[in-house]
Every structure is written in structure tokens, then in C-alpha cells.
């Protein structure tokens, strides 16, 4: 069984948060994926998505969020450039597969940015800012406006406990259920 | 000590197959993703693709998609690579090499532990 | 796929000498960018990570600079255990790639 886990990233304003997120990639290479927030007490909240059907590494950017998904390597690429103090939150990959629920993508991250420029990208203690220049082919992708009712209704509180779940990725179906989520730092 | 270790050569024949083990010890197998990495004699080095070994999730590069599979054992802490319809071509020296990350999501591809790497010689 | 052109493919220089090497990609990769020091019969050694990151426990002498598409790799001073191939990795787009690799020997 794999666990249901979160990870903390902790990065300054004006840093690069640059993760990817795994999926089977015989059963999602070409469903389209988006990046969403989850903030306390709200549904998930759909910041950018890829295309549909998703496009082989074919960079999408919304504001300063760029999607890019590696149909051959089962990898989205999601970076949020420039960060700021109110990017802070829970955010998640997932995949949508109408008419059945989305899937979420392990591992959730717990964002933290804090003021006071560091000139460290991404997660690299000691390097230069990193500085994004998207490229001109990048596009803009419509997202689905639909949040399923039975979907996250809250977001876990952090917590020690394991959640597992038979498969790589997770139904969002009755997440309500899930109580404790592992926090990794 | 941490280290992968991996089996021995191999000589095959052209369209045979091989399975190459890599061994963790010495860290928690499960939290850091395999790549599969290869060097033919005189060559330069060629990445194969990668595996996460909590979920068994793999990507490929697409030369080796159809001939190449990556699993793994965690119950022994053991990464295979495995490859298919062998060709001369395929002579090289295979490494298995674990991707380092600061956080386990973040887009970092730095190999911090390689293994001592697997001779595979394909002659008729 | 992102073409690295790492540059020579050998050298010969004294011992103490300054060396540089360089790789150029084909497109911008952000700094993602890696070397690597392979000594005949052992697996390839992490040098440099992001561009510019000195692995833990790797001497002073070696660094890494560069941005969008041009990388630099320099050892400030030679030594002659720094006899080896040395290799760039990109990963600001998959798949991963390699530089050719540059033979460094000793006059």
C-alpha cells in the first residue's frame, strides 16, 4: 500500500518551487492534469491545467504557474515562479477523467514562503536565483470549472498518522474520510 | 554503508534478454528513485529512464520503450533493469544510479550513488 | 531532445594549471545543469549540482558557473588524482542528457 503523504517545502520570496509529481503512465500519459490549491475549510481550487488531451512536453503557464508533462517519463513538471508570502498552502497534482472522479497525485505539498529575498532556487541551499524565461510556444489551457461535490470538503490537518491506499494514485471520492496525513520535512 | 551493488556481467546473444539486479543498503530503498544509466565502450553516458521504488511508477526514454522494464523487489531492497531483443549495439556498461533530492518530489536529477556498474556483452 | 556540446573532448595540461570546460545546450535549461568525474573502471561522481553547488566532501578546486544555454566547469588548480573524464548532465528537459565528456590528462 502506498501512503498518503505530504511534504513541506519551505522557500523565500522570489525563489522557483519546481516539483514533479509520478503517474502511471499506461493509464494517464494523455489525461489531462491540472495543479490545484487546498486551503482550510474549501474545495480544492484549480490553478492551471494542462491541455486536453495533455500535449507531450508541451508547457502550459497560467500567471506564474508553467505545467509541463512528460507523457514518455509518466512526470508532470509544475513550477511556480517568483513566489509569494500568500502562495502559501497545500497544493496537489491530479487527473481528470470524466465522468469519474479526478485522481490525485502523491505526494501533496505543504508550501511555506516566507519573507526576506534568499537568492536560492527551488530547494538548492546555495545557489543563484533562478531565473524562468518561458518559452514562446508556451500556452494557455481551459480548465474544467466543475469541483465534484463529493470531493475534499477539507483540508487535513497535519498530523503523524498513515493513510493507505492500494494503488499510486487516489480516488478523491470521500476524502472527507481522511483524517491524518504524515508531514515530511 | 550506503552503496547499490549490482550483478555481475553478461554475455548474450542478439535477441536474447538480460535482467540486471542493483542492491540498496544503508538507506531506505524506498525513498529515493532508481535511474538506470549505461556507457557503451568508448562512449559517453545515456540515461534509460527511472523508477520510483515506493510505487513502482517508471518513465523510459523513448529509444528503449518496448525493450526496456524497470522493476523492483523492496521487500530485498533490489532495482532490476531489464532489456529486451538485444543487438550488439547494446553492449555497454549499465549503471544503476539513485536520484538525490532534497524533497522527494522536487525536480532535482542528481545521482549521489551510483553502483559499480554491469558489463553486458551481446555477441553472436 | 536537449543536444549538450561539452567542449574539448580533451585536454592535456600541467600540473596546477587552471582548466576549463564548457557545455553549450541547445535550448535554455535554466541552470539545471550537473558534472560528473568518471575514473576508468568507477562509476561516475558527483561534482557540481544546479549549475554552481559544490557536492558535499568535493575539494575547493572544482566549480561550476553558468546560465541559460552556456556552462563552465573549472578545476582552479590540478591535481593528478583529477585525472579522469568529466561529464555534463542537463535536466531542465527530459530526457536527461549527457556532454560527450572531456578527457583531462596530465602533461
Known amino acids: 500500500a502506498t501512503k498518503l503523504t505530504e511534504e513541506k517545502y519551505e522557500l523565500k520570496e522570489g525563489q522557483t518551487l519546481d516539483v514533479k509529481c509520478d503517474y502511471t503512465l499506461e493509464k494517464f500519459a494523455s489525461s489531462q492534469k491540472a495543479w490545484q490549491i487546498i486551503r482550510d475549510g474549501e474545495m480544492p481550487k484549480t490553478l492551471a491545467c494542462t491541455e486536453r488531451p495533455s500535449k507531450n512536453s508541451h508547457p502550459v503557464q497560467v500567471g506564474r504557474i508553467i505545467l509541463e508533462d512528460y507523457h514518455d517519463h509518466g512526470l508532470l513538471r509544475v513550477r511556480m515562479v517568483n513566489l509569494q508570502v500568500e502562495d502559501s498552502g497545500l497544493y496537489q497534482c491530479v487527473i481528470y477523467q470524466p465522468p469519474k472522479e479526478p485522481h490525485m497525485l502523491f505526494d501533496r505539498i505543504r508550501l511555506v514562503v516566507t519573507k526576506g529575498f534568499s537568492g536560492t532556487p527551488g530547494s538548492n541551499e546555495n545557489s543563484t536565483q533562478n531565473v524562468y524565461k518561458i518559452p514562446p510556444t508556451t500556452t494557455k489551457a481551459l480548465c474544467p470549472l466543475y469541483t465534484s461535490p463529493r470531493t475534499v470538503t477539507q483540508a487535513p490537518p497535519k498530523s503523524t498518522a498513515d493513510v493507505s491506499t492500494p494503488d499510486s494514485e487516489i480516488n478523491l471520492t470521500n476524502v472527507t474520510d481522511i483524517i491524518r496525513v504524515p508531514v515530511f520535512n | 554503508q550506503v552503496q547499490l551493488v549490482q550483478s555481475g556481467a553478461e554475455v548474450k546473444k542478439p535477441g536474447a534478454s538480460v535482467k540486471v539486479s542493483c542492491k540498496a543498503s544503508?538507506?531506505?530503498?524506498?525513498?529515493?528513485?532508481i535511474n538506470w544509466v549505461r556507457q557503451a565502450t568508448g562512449q559517453g553516458l545515456e540515461w534509460m529512464g527511472w523508477?520510483?521504488?515506493?510505487?513502482?511508477?517508471?518513465g523510459y526514454v523513448k529509444k528503449f520503450q518496448g525493450r526496456v522494464t524497470m522493476t523492483r523487489d523492496t521487500s530485498i531492497s533490489t532495482a532490476y533493469m531489464e532489456l529486451s531483443s538485444l543487438r550488439s549495439e547494446d553492449t555497454a556498461v549499465y549503471y544503476c544510479?539513485?536520484?538525490?533530492?532534497?524533497?522527494?518530489?522536487?525536480?532535482?536529477?542528481?545521482?549521489?550513488?551510483w553502483g559499480r556498474g554491469t558489463l553486458v556483452t551481446v555477441s553472436s | 531532445d536537449t543536444q549538450m556540446t561539452q567542449s574539448p573532448s580533451s585536454l592535456s595540461a600541467s600540473e596546477g594549471d587552471r582548466v576549463t570546460i564548457t557545455c553549450q545546450a541547445s535550448?535554455?535549461?535554466?541552470?539545471?545543469l550537473n558534472w560528473y568525474q568518471e575514473k576508468p573502471g568507477k562509476a561516475p561522481k558527483l561534482l557540481i549540482y544546479?549549475?554552481?553547488n559544490l557536492e558535499t566532501g568535493v575539494p575547493s578546486r572544482f566549480s561550476g558557473s553558468g546560465s541559460g544555454t552556456d556552462y563552465t566547469f573549472t578545476i582552479s588548480s590540478l591535481q593528478p588524482e583529477d585525472i579522469a573524464t568529466y561529464y555534463c548532465?542537463?535536466?531542465?528537459?527530459?530526457?536527461?542528457?549527457f556532454g560527450g565528456g572531456t578527457k583531462v590528462e596530465i602533461k
Open positions: 544503508g538507506y531506505t530503498f524506498t525513498s529515493y528513485d
Open positions: 544546479h549549475a554552481s
Open positions: 548532465q542537463q535536466y531542465g528537459n527530459l530526457p536527461l542528457t
Open positions: 535550448q535554455d535549461i535554466f541552470n539545471d
Open positions: 544510479a539513485r536520484r538525490r533530492a532534497v524533497y522527494r518530489s522536487s525536480w532535482e536529477w542528481y545521482f549521489d550513488l
Open positions: 523508477m520510483n521504488p515506493n510505487r513502482g511508477n517508471t
